[in-house]
Interface confidence: medium
C-alpha cells in the first residue's frame, strides 16, 4: 500500500508495480519560496539546496522561542511532499529553498518579490532545465504581486501557488489570483473539499485544479526520520508542483500553457463533491483533481482545451465582463452566463493584437460572466466573422467562408433588452456545417480557424420541452471548442464548457411559465487535430 | 539611534546630488495610482512598493528613489531605500511615512505604489 | 514480547532467487515495521532493506536496489524478504529484525518517528549460493 | 551513505576490566546510534539506543555516550559472558552498521 494521496495522483496502470515514470522530475529545479527547512531529513537529504536567500519580517509576541523544528516544519513537509524519498510525488527533483517566511509561518508582499526577483536573477545567472516555483503561501489581493508572478511566468518559468486556507473566493488572494500562475485548491481522501478548521481550501475561478491536501504524511523536521501528517492548499499546491516537474521532465520544451493544459487533460474529472462550495462559486469552481499522465511520453495529438471564467460584471446595464486566453493560447469560442438570465449575450472581439470575449449585461441584470474557451492550436489562424440581424423570419446566419477555414465557436450579441420568443430552424441546412444560427434580432459572430489538419463537426441536443439543463458532449478523440444555445431567448441563463461537454442552462420553469414550445438545443462545436494526431504517430 | 545616523548621512547625499527643480516632470495625462491590502490586519503601513513603469532602467529606478529621498527631507521627512527592484519589475522598496504617498504618486516613471501586506504559510 | 520465527535454509544456484519468511508470534506486531540485516560468514551486518511503517512502502539499501523486494502480509503475520539474481557472495545469514515506529501528537498533528532500532530479531536463515 | 569506522578492530581483556569501544561516523549522525552485542552463531542483541539509553533487561555496566560524529560503549566492569562483538548502528539516514570489536579474553 501507498499513501492515499500518492495513489490518488497515480494512474491505474502504475498502480500495481512502480507508482511513477522513472526519471521522476530530474531534468526539472524546483524552488520553494517558505519557511527554513530541515534539509538533512533522510527524505530530502541531498534534493534540496538551500540558498543563502533569506528576507523575512520579525516574529511577532516578545516571549516567542525559535525552535529550529518548529521554524522548519513547513518548508520541509512540503518539500517532502514534492520530491521525498519515500513519500514523494517526484522523487528524482531537485530543490532549492529560499526564505521568506518566518518561524510562525509569516511573511511580507516585499519579501516575497525580492524572493521571485532573485530566482530570475538566478535563472539569467545560470541557465538550467525547467523551472517551477512553489508558493505555499497566501496574502490579500496584490497587485504588484500578480505582475511579478506574470513577469516570471513570461521568462519560462512554471509558478504553482496554494489557494489559500480561507474558504473563501481565491480571486481575493495573492499569487492565488494571478492568471499566469498555476494556482491549487485542496480535497481529502474522500474527494471532498478539505476543510479546515471553521475554514477550508478557497475555491472559484482563480483556482485551475485541485489536489490532495489533508492527512498528507510527509517529513518532519521533529527528527531526520520523522514524518508528520499536515493540511492545507501548500500540501495541494506541492503535490501539482511535483507533477508539473515529472511532466517537464519527460517534455522539457513544454510550454506554461501546454503544462497547464495537461494538467487539466489529465486531472480527474467530476469527483469532486461540489455542494460544498457557496452556491454562487460552484460553475466557476474547476471540478478536477490533479493526475500524473498515464505515460511519459507526451500526449502532442491531442488537441487540448480549457474554459476560463471572466470576473463577474456588476450590475449595471452597460457592465460587461472580459474573459481572456493566456498569450500561447488560441480564444476559439466565446459564451455567457448570468444567473438571472438578464443579458445581452458575448461576442469576441480584438484587444492589444488578441482576440478576447466579451459579455454584456442587461437592464436590470444582476451582472454577467464571460466564458472563453482556450486550446493550444499551433501555426493556427482565426479570425471572427459577424452577421448583424437579420430582422428576418428564418433567424441570423453566419459561416466561414474562408478556403480552409473551419468553425470552432458561435456567439450571439444582442442590443435590445428582451429576445422575443423565436423559433429558428434547430437543424441547419445539410452540407452547412461551418454556419452559426441565431436570434433574428442579434448579431452572430463564427470564429473561424484555419491551422493543419482542423476538422470540426457540429453536434447538437435539443429537448422539446424546457429543462433547467441541456448537455450534448463530444465523443473519445473529439475536444469541445465551442458551446452556445439555441435560441437565444430570454429564459436561456447561458451555455459553457465543463471539460468535454456543452452545458446549457435555462431559467426554473416553475418560476417563468414558459411553454413547452420553447425548446432549448445545445450546440457543442467538436474538433480534432489530424496533423497533431499524425506527427505524433511518426515520432513514435 | 546608529541606524538613523546612518540615514541621515544617506539623505544629506541625496540632498546633494539633486537639484531643486523637477527634471523629469511625469508625463501627462498619467496618473500613478496607490494600492492597499483590502485585510486591514495584514496591512504593512510605513513600508511601500514604488512600481515604475515597465521599460524603466535601473539607473532610473535609483534616481527616482533618490528623488524621493530628497524631497521628503526637504519636507522634513526621514526615508530609507530597502531594496531596488530590476530584473522582474523595475521599482524601490522604501520605509517612509504615508504622509509622503502624494509625493511619491507625482515622481516620474512612477506606475502605482502598493503598501506591504503580510503573507502566510497555507 | 514479540518471537520472529525465520524459515530454513536454502541452498540456490547462482542467477535464482530465494524468497526468505519471518513469522510474528506473542504480543502485538506490526508486520509493516520489519527489516532485513545479512551477515556474510566471518562479516559484519549489513542492512539491507526494511518496510516503512508510516507509508507503507519498502526502503531498500542502494547496493541491493532493484535486486530485492520485501513484503508483508498482514493477515499471517509474515513478513518476506526475496533476493533475486544471487551470486556467490551472496551466501549470507539474512536476519529479519523488528524496528521502531513511534506515534506522537505535536501541534495538533501526529509525528510518527521511524527508527531504525532493532529491538527483537529473528534466528537467521542461512542461505548458500552454490553451483 | 553514512560510513561507520569502529575502534579497535578487537582488543584482549580480563573479568573486571574497564573497556571502551569507540564509534565515528563519517557525518553527524545527532545521537542516532545504537550498539549491539553479537555471540557465535546467535542473532544480535540491542544494548544501547539513542547513543545512550539502555536497552531494558540489560546490565548497568553497558552504559553509552556521545553525539554528533563520536560515540562511545563502555563496560564498566568486563563479565564473563561479556566476550562477544560488538557493532554500533547509526539511523540518522539509511542504516549503517560499523564493521565490528571483537571482545576476547586475554
Known amino acids: 500500500s501507498i499513501p492515499w494521496n500518492l495513489e490518488r495522483i497515480t494512474p491505474p496502470r502504475y498502480r500495481a508495480d512502480e507508482y511513477q515514470p522513472p526519471d521522476g522530475g530530474s531534468l526539472v529545479e524546483v524552488y520553494l519560496l517558505d519557511t527554513s527547512i530541515q534539509s538533512d531529513h533522510r527524505e530530502i537529504e541531498g534534493r534540496v539546496m538551500v540558498t543563502d536567500f533569506e528576507n523575512v519580517p520579525e516574529e511577532d509576541g516578545t516571549r516567542f522561542h525559535r525552535q529550529a523544528s518548529k521554524c522548519d516544519s513547513h518548508g520541509t513537509h512540503l518539500a517532502g511532499v514534492v520530491s521525498g524519498r519515500d513519500a514523494g510525488v517526484a522523487k528524482g527533483a531537485s530543490m532549492r529553498s529560499l526564505r521568506v517566511l518566518n518561524c510562525q509561518g509569516k511573511g511580507t508582499v516585499s519579501g516575497t518579490l525580492i524572493g521571485l526577483e532573485f530566482i530570475r536573477k538566478s535563472q539569467l545567472v545560470q541557465p538550467v532545465g525547467p523551472l517551477v516555483v512553489l508558493l505555499p503561501l497566501a496574502g490579500g489581493y496584490s497587485r504588484v504581486l500578480n505582475a511579478a508572478c506574470q513577469r516570471l511566468a513570461r521568462a519560462g518559468v512554471v509558478l504553482v501557488t496554494a489557494a489559500g486556507n480561507f474558504r473563501d473566493d481565491a480571486c481575493l488572494y495573492s499569487p492565488a489570483s494571478a492568471p499566469e500562475v498555476i494556482t491549487v485548491g485542496a480535497t481529502n481522501a474522500q474527494d471532498q473539499p478539505v476543510t479546515l478548521g471553521t475554514l477550508g481550501t478557497n475555491f472559484g475561478r482563480c483556482v485551475d485544479l485541485f489536489a490532495p491536501g489533508e492527512d498528507i504524511i510527509g517529513a518532519s523536521s521533529d527528527c531526520s526520520t520523522c514524518f508528520v501528517s499536515q493540511s492545507g492548499t501548500s500540501q495541494a499546491a506541492a503535490h501539482v508542483a511535483g507533477i508539473a516537474a515529472m511532466m517537464l521532465s519527460a517534455e522539457p520544451e513544454l510550454t506554461l500553457a501546454e503544462l497547464r493544459q495537461r494538467l487539466i487533460h489529465f486531472s480527474a474529472k467530476d469527483v469532486i463533491n461540489e455542494a460544498w462550495f457557496p452556491e454562487d462559486q460552484r460553475v466557476l469552481t474547476p471540478n478536477l483533481v490533479a493526475a500524473l499522465p498515464p505515460s511519459t511520453h507526451g500526449a502532442g495529438w491531442q488537441l487540448f482545451c480549457r474554459t476560463v471564467w471572466s470576473a463577474h460584471s456588476g450590475p449595471t446595464r452597460m457592465a460587461t465582463a472580459i474573459a481572456r486566453c493566456a498569450p500561447d493560447e488560441e480564444l476559439l469560442s466565446c459564451s455567457s452566463f448570468s444567473r438571472s438570465g438578464k443579458r445581452r449575450g458575448e461576442r469576441m472581439e480584438a484587444q492589444g493584437g488578441k482576440l478576447v470575449c466579451r459579455a454584456h449585461n442587461a437592464f436590470g441584470g444582476e451582472g454577467v460572466y464571460a466564458i472563453a474557451r482556450c486550446c493550444l492550436l499551433p501555426q493556427a489562424n482565426c479570425s471572427v466573422h459577424t452577421a448583424p440581424p437579420a430582422e428576418a423570419s428564418m433567424g441570423t446566419r453566419v459561416h466561414c467562408h474562408q478556403q480552409g477555414h473551419v468553425l470552432t465557436g458561435c456567439s450571439s450579441h444582442w442590443e435590445v433588452e428582451d429576445l422575443g420568443t423565436h423559433k429558428p430552424p434547430v437543424l441547419r441546412p445539410r452540407g452547412q456545417p461551418n454556419q452559426c444560427v441565431g436570434h433574428r434580432e442579434a448579431s452572430i459572430h463564427a470564429s473561424c480557424c484555419h491551422a493543419p489538419g482542423l476538422e470540426c463537426k457540429v453536434k447538437e441536443h435539443g429537448i422539446p420541452a424546457p429543462q433547467e439543463q441541456v448537455t450534448v458532449a463530444c465523443e473519445e478523440g473529439w475536444t469541445l471548442t465551442g458551446c452556445s444555445a439555441l435560441p437565444g431567448t430570454s429564459h436561456v441563463l447561458g451555455a459553457y464548457a465543463v471539460d468535454n461537454t456543452c452545458v446549457v442552462r435555462s431559467r426554473d420553469v416553475s418560476t417563468t411559465g414558459s411553454t413547452s414550445e420553447e425548446a432549448v438545443t445545445a450546440v457543442a462545436i467538436c474538433c480534432r487535430s489530424r496533423h497533431l494526431a499524425q506527427a505524433s504517430q511518426e515520432l513514435q | 539611534q546608529e541606524d538613523e545616523d546612518g540615514d541621515y548621512e544617506e539623505l544629506v547625499l541625496a540632498l546633494r546630488s539633486e537639484e531643486d527643480g523637477l527634471a523629469e516632470a511625469p508625463e501627462h495625462g498619467t496618473t500613478a495610482t496607490f494600492h492597499r491590502c483590502a485585510k486591514d490586519p495584514w496591512r504593512l503601513p510605513g513600508t511601500y512598493v514604488v512600481v515604475l513603469k515597465e521599460e524603466t532602467h535601473l539607473s532610473q529606478s535609483e534616481r527616482t528613489a533618490r528623488r524621493l529621498q530628497a524631497q521628503a527631507a526637504r519636507r522634513g521627512y526621514l526615508t530609507k531605500i530597502l531594496h531596488v527592484f530590476h530584473g522582474l519589475l523595475p521599482g524601490f522598496l522604501v520605509k517612509m511615512s504615508g504622509d509622503l504617498l502624494e509625493l511619491a504618486l507625482k515622481l516620474p516613471h512612477v506606475d502605482y505604489i502598493e503598501e506591504d501586506s503580510s503573507v502566510f504559510a497555507q | 514480547q514479540v518471537q520472529l520465527v525465520q524459515s530454513g535454509a536454502e541452498v540456490k544456484k547462482p542467477g535464482s532467487s530465494v524468497k526468505v519468511s519471518c513469522k510474528a508470534s506473542?504480543?502485538?506486531?506490526?508486520?509493516?515495521?520489519i527489516s532485513w540485516v545479512r551477515q556474510a560468514p566471518g562479516q559484519g551486518l549489513e542492512w539491507m532493506g526494511g518496510?516503512?511503517?508510516?507509508?507503507?512502502?519498502?526502503n531498500y539499501a542502494q547496493k541491493f536496489q532493484g535486486r530485492v523486494t520485501i513484503t508483508a502480509d498482514e493477515s499471517t503475520s509474515t513478513a518476506y524478504m526475496e533476493l533475486s539474481s544471487l551470486r556467490s557472495e551472496d551466501t549470507a545469514v539474512y536476519y529479519c529484525?523488528?524496528?521502531?515506529?513511534?506515534?506522537?501528537?505535536?501541534?495538533?498533528?501526529?509525528?510518527?518517528?521511524?527508527?531504525?532500532?532493532?529491538?527483537?530479531w529473528g534466528q537467521g536463515t542461512l542461505v548458500t549460493v552454490s553451483s | 551513505d553514512i560510513q561507520m569506522t569502529q575502534s579497535p578492530s578487537s582488543l584482549s581483556a580480563s573479568v573486571g576490566d574497564r573497556v571502551t569501544i569507540t564509534c565515528r561516523a563519517s557525518?553527524?549522525?545527532?545521537?542516532?546510534l545504537n550498539w549491539y552485542q553479537q555471540k557465535p552463531g546467535k542473532a544480535p542483541k540491542l544494548l544501547i539506543y539513542?547513543?545512550?539509553t539502555l536497552q531494558s533487561g540489560v546490565p548497568s555496566r553497558f552504559s553509552g555516550s556521545g553525539s554528533g560524529t563520536d560515540f562511545t560503549l563502555t563496560i564498566s566492569s568486563l563479565q564473563p559472558e561479556d566476550f562477544a562483538v560488538y557493532y554500533c548502528?547509526?539511523?540518522?539516514?539509511?542504516?549503517?552498521f560499523g564493521q565490528g570489536t571483537k571482545v576476547e579474553i586475554k
Open positions: 506473542g504480543g502485538t506486531f506490526n508486520s509493516h515495521a
Open positions: 557525518q553527524g549522525i545527532r545521537s542516532a
Open positions: 529484525a523488528r524496528h521502531y515506529e513511534i506515534q506522537i501528537g505535536r501541534y495538533g498533528m501526529n509525528v510518527y518517528y521511524l527508527m531504525y532500532r532493532f529491538a527483537s
Open positions: 518496510i516503512n511503517p508510516i507509508l507503507g512502502i519498502a
Open positions: 539513542n547513543g545512550s
Open positions: 548502528q547509526q539511523f540518522d539516514g539509511d542504516p549503517t
